[in-house]
């Protein structure tokens, strides 16, 4: 709403905020290696920080969320960092008849907002 | 994936994972008394509790999320409770001209799963 | 700097058999993809195959399946594209590239390799 | 025939603005980011595009790329001598895995 300003600056210093990051896993780490061959080790951005007032609010649910949680911090939980997006990524697998490509829409995070 | 299971029994107890909650709120409470003339109190419905491992876990991304939190629980947050979907609500305004109805498909919380 | 340097041109009777290489440098060979893609005299790109270096897995675009092999030595940073009994059809541009990190697109490319198959 | 479809040929003067589309189906561009390459005359191809509209470093910001339902779109600006070249669009196909546009022939008038 145009009542409500979502902010890009992170209040609590660089880095502390919700952003993108990323994390090395190998496929052992993800319990795949049974079937997934290829790549043996993957580069996963996830979101991680924190979620101060107004801060890359995803929606009005979210800036209410952060309003509501300054009032009842008990009751309603701070807006979390999550996906916003996505982007696509492409595994070997091992089938009955040999090898495949499958792709996976949900599996990298693009971007982050909390929500 | 098939070789990933999600699951919808909460292993903390009854209300402790990630649900959807009614939350009681005034115009006041939100900020919006200025500019939103009605209903005066909103019934929010908002997504609260926690996701242990593979709890409703939203998709691939949510489930690797929980396995790389187990296995690095300092550098990668474990997912969290957030909107699936949402139901859309009318308010009325006030405008320059009078009062205005409009809809707002972001607000009130439908589904809730672990992202 | 990343390169990819192929093989150079080659001149082949029907029914010979070819091997052309593509050499990477300047990262890591083993952590990316490469691909084959085919361009006939005055025709557009065609996917052949894919092939990850580290655990030398291949697969092939259904057209080229049985008709090529791709396989890769990573001890020398170099992936292969060969045939076992060539076809005046096999006349054409050949070239590799690498994946990029999430294996959708093709970040880095080959000169290419000119194979001529005539009698 | 191409799974992803493309104009054979497009030109533009000088300073124009060109557009060269890359249609598609459910099963590929529909699903999956699209690519874009430039080919230049007796050279390989070369990354212009990735995951519909990012450049790669060094490309300049003439071009850009888009994507809506089962279509996109390379916007050249500023055309200039240089562009000209075969343009390939590439996505992934659920069925023959990476797929390449029939290419399109830019000219640069004049």
């Known amino acids: 709403s145009a009542h409500l300003h979502p902010r890009d600056s992170c209040p609590l210093g660089p880095g502390r905020c919700c952003h993108l990051e990323t994390v090395q896993a190998t496929l052992e780490d993800l319990g795949w290696s049974d079937w997934v061959l290829s790549p043996r080790q993957l580069q996963l951005s996830m979101c991680v920080g924190e979620c101060p007032h107004l801060y890359r609010s995803a929606n009005t649910h979210a800036l209410i969320k952060a309003r509501l949680h300054g009032l009842q911090p008990d009751r309603v939980p701070a807006p979390c960092c999550v996906p916003s997006s996505y982007t696509p990524v492409v595994l070997m697998h091992r089938t009955d008849s040999g090898v495949s490509l499958q792709t996976y829409d949900d599996l990298v995070a693009q971007g982050c907002h909390c929500a | 994936s098939a070789h990933l299971h999600p699951r919808d029994s909460c292993p903390l107890g009854p209300g402790r994972c990630c649900h959807l909650e009614t939350v009681q709120a005034t115009l006041e409470d939100l900020g919006w008394s200025d500019w939103v003339l009605s209903p005066r109190q909103l019934q929010l419905s908002m997504c609260v509790g926690e996701c242990p491992h593979l709890y409703r876990s939203a998709n691939t991304h949510a489930l690797i999320k929980a396995r790389l939190h187990g296995l690095q629980p300092d550098r990668v947050p474990a997912p969290c409770c957030v909107p699936s979907s949402y139901t859309p609500v009318v308010l009325m305004h006030r405008t320059d001209s009078g009062v205005s109805l409009q809809t707002y498909d972001d607000l009130v919380a439908q589904g809730c799963h672990c992202a | 700097e990343v390169q990819l340097v192929q093989s150079g041109a080659e001149v082949k009777k029907p029914g010979e058999s070819l091997k052309i290489s593509c050499k990477g440098s300047?990262?890591?060979?083993?952590?990316?993809?490469i691909g084959w893609v085919r361009q006939m005299p005055g025709k557009g790109l065609e996917w052949m195959g894919v092939i990850d270096p580290d655990g030398s897995y291949t697969i092939y675009s259904p057209s080229f399946q049985g008709q090529v092999t791709i396989s890769a030595d990573k001890s020398i940073s170099t992936a292969y594209l060969q045939w076992s009994s060539l076809k005046a059809s096999d006349t054409a541009m050949y070239y590799c590239a690498r994946y990029g990190r999430y294996g959708t697109y093709f970040d880095y490319w080959g000169q290419g390799t000119l194979v001529t198959v005539s009698s | 025939q191409s799974v992803l479809t493309q104009p054979p040929s497009v030109s533009g003067a000088p300073g124009q603005r060109v557009t060269i589309s890359c249609s598609g189906s459910s099963s590929n561009i529909g699903v999956l980011y699209v690519n874009w390459y430039q080919q230049l005359p007796g050279t390989a191809p070369k990354l212009l595009i990735y995951?519909?509209?990012n450049r790669p470093s060094g490309v300049p910001d003439r071009f850009s790329g888009s994507k809506s339902g089962t279509s996109a779109s390379l916007a050249i600006t500023g055309l200039q001598a240089e562009d000209e070249a075969d343009y390939y669009c590439?996505?992934?196909?659920?069925?023959?895995?990476?797929?390449f546009g029939g290419g399109t022939k830019l000219t640069v008038l004049g």
């Open positions: 300047g990262y890591s060979f083993t952590s990316y993809w």
């Open positions: 590439q996505s992934w196909d659920s069925s023959s895995n990476y797929v």
């Open positions: 995951s519909n509209d």
